[in-house]
């Protein structure tokens, strides 16, 4: 008989190399039976995982599994780091393995403006 516990299928030592300035979707595969659990994303800061507020998320349903998606539109250099999804199910908190994003800043160092120039780019 198949278990009806919620399971989060992020592989151990999962990682993604991505480019800043382009969109990216970070997926948390969620297996559940009846009621879809409440799932959240957090970002690791040392040993603490800080809950991500004000971030766009969505669900993608497939036949045997669902995905809770964290949207990066676009990826920023600050998004570099490790993330974890967690599910609340029958008063239990289930945490996934962490997944790491390695963000490459596509704007080369030579193209990077100085602090004084940085704000001036915002002029039409």
């Amino acid at each position: 008989k198949e278990s009806c516990d919620v399971q989060l299928y992020i592989k151990e030592q999962s990682e993604h190399s991505i480019l800043a300035g382009d969109p990216f979707e970070l997926e948390c595969p969620v297996k559940y039976c009846a009621n879809r659990p409440h799932v959240t994303w957090c970002k690791l800061n040392g040993t603490t995982c800080v809950k991500l507020e004000d971030r766009q998320t969505s669900w993608k349903e497939e036949k045997n599994i669902s995905f809770f998606i964290l949207h990066f539109e676009p990826v920023l250099p600050n998004d570099n780091g490790s993330y974890r999804c967690s599910a609340n199910f029958q008063s239990n908190l289930i945490e996934s393995h962490s997944t790491t994003l390695y963000v490459t800043d596509v704007k080369s160092a030579s193209e990077r403006p100085s602090k004084d120039e940085m704000a001036s780019r915002f002029w039409a």
Epitope: D22, E53, R55, Q56, H71, P74, L76, N78, V106, R121
Partner: antibody, heavy 120, light 106 residues
Framework: QVQLKESGPGLVAPSQSLSITCTVS????????VHWVRQSPGKGLEWLGV???????SYNPAPMSRLSISKDNSKSQVFLKMNSLQTDDTAMYYC??????????????WGQGTSVTVSS | QIVLSQSPAILSASPGEKVTMTCRAS?????MHWYQQKPGSSPKPWIY???NLASGVPARFSGSGSGTSYSLTISRMEAEDAATYYC?????????FGGGTKLEIK
């Protein structure tokens, strides 16, 4: 010097389609995203969608079914196509460059806009 | 979608007067951008990421806020500040703008 310039038909008949070209200079479409924003008296500023540097697109869900954004990196051009125009699509259409900093994203350089009137 | 409500819609201020306009979001956003637009021109970035002034923007302008409430303040109104100011969020698609605050000089 960063510049974006829109070119459009000006007048479009109802139910017809709209095609606008945005020609950019001073930056590469493989490094920066280009957005389409329109401004109408009735709806104010409305973000329509973006062509990301890697070639993916994101759209405003409301007009999404009528919208298509594409680009030609070699010609430094981004294209907006909108089908089934109605009178409330009458607006000034802007293409706008998007840029990221360490922890935020913003639209920085705006084109001068192209005025589109939907009328028979 | 996140709705941005700007108030007041029209604001009239005398030279030298302190001016504050607000932008309220229907859901929490990470930061807010502000654009200035004058008749016949494209919008110009004015304040980005809540409180950073764009280059050339006078120091009498400031921005603040967090969560669902943001504001733009002018410490001393000047004639050249007369324009429409729009807030804009880049937290959730569709990326929305406020309806604008039209600032007039008395």
């Amino acid at each position: 010097q960063v510049q974006l310039k829109e070119s459009g038909p000006g007048l479009v008949a109802p139910s017809q389609s709209l095609s606008i070209t945005c020609t950019v200079s001073g930056f590469s479409l493989t490094t920066y995203g280009v957005h389409w924003v329109r401004q109408s008296p009735g709806k104010g500023l409305e973000w329509l969608g973006v062509m990301w540097p890697g070639g993916r697109t994101s759209y405003n869900p409301a007009p999404m079914s009528r919208l298509s954004i594409s680009k030609d990196n070699s010609k430094s051009q981004v294209f907006l196509k909108m089908n089934s125009l109605q009178t409330d699509d009458t607006a000034m259409y802007y293409c706008v460059r998007g840029d990221y900093e360490y922890d935020y994203y913003a639209m920085d350089y705006w084109g001068q806009g192209t005025s589109v009137t939907v009328s028979s | 979608q996140i709705v941005l409500s700007q108030s007041p819609a029209i604001l009239s201020a005398s030279p030298g007067e302190k001016v504050t306009m607000t932008c309220r979001a229907s859901s929490s956003v990470s930061y807010m951008h502000w654009y200035q637009q004058k008749p016949g021109s494209s919008p110009k970035p004015w304040i980005y990421a809540t409180s950073n002034l764009a280059s050339g923007v006078p120091a009498r302008f400031s921005g603040s806020g967090s969560g669902t409430s943001y504001s733009l303040t002018i410490s001393r109104m000047e004639a050249e500040d007369a324009a429409t100011y729009y807030c804009h969020q880049w937290s959730s698609n569709p990326y929305t703008f406020g309806g604008g605050t039209k600032l007039e000089i008395k």
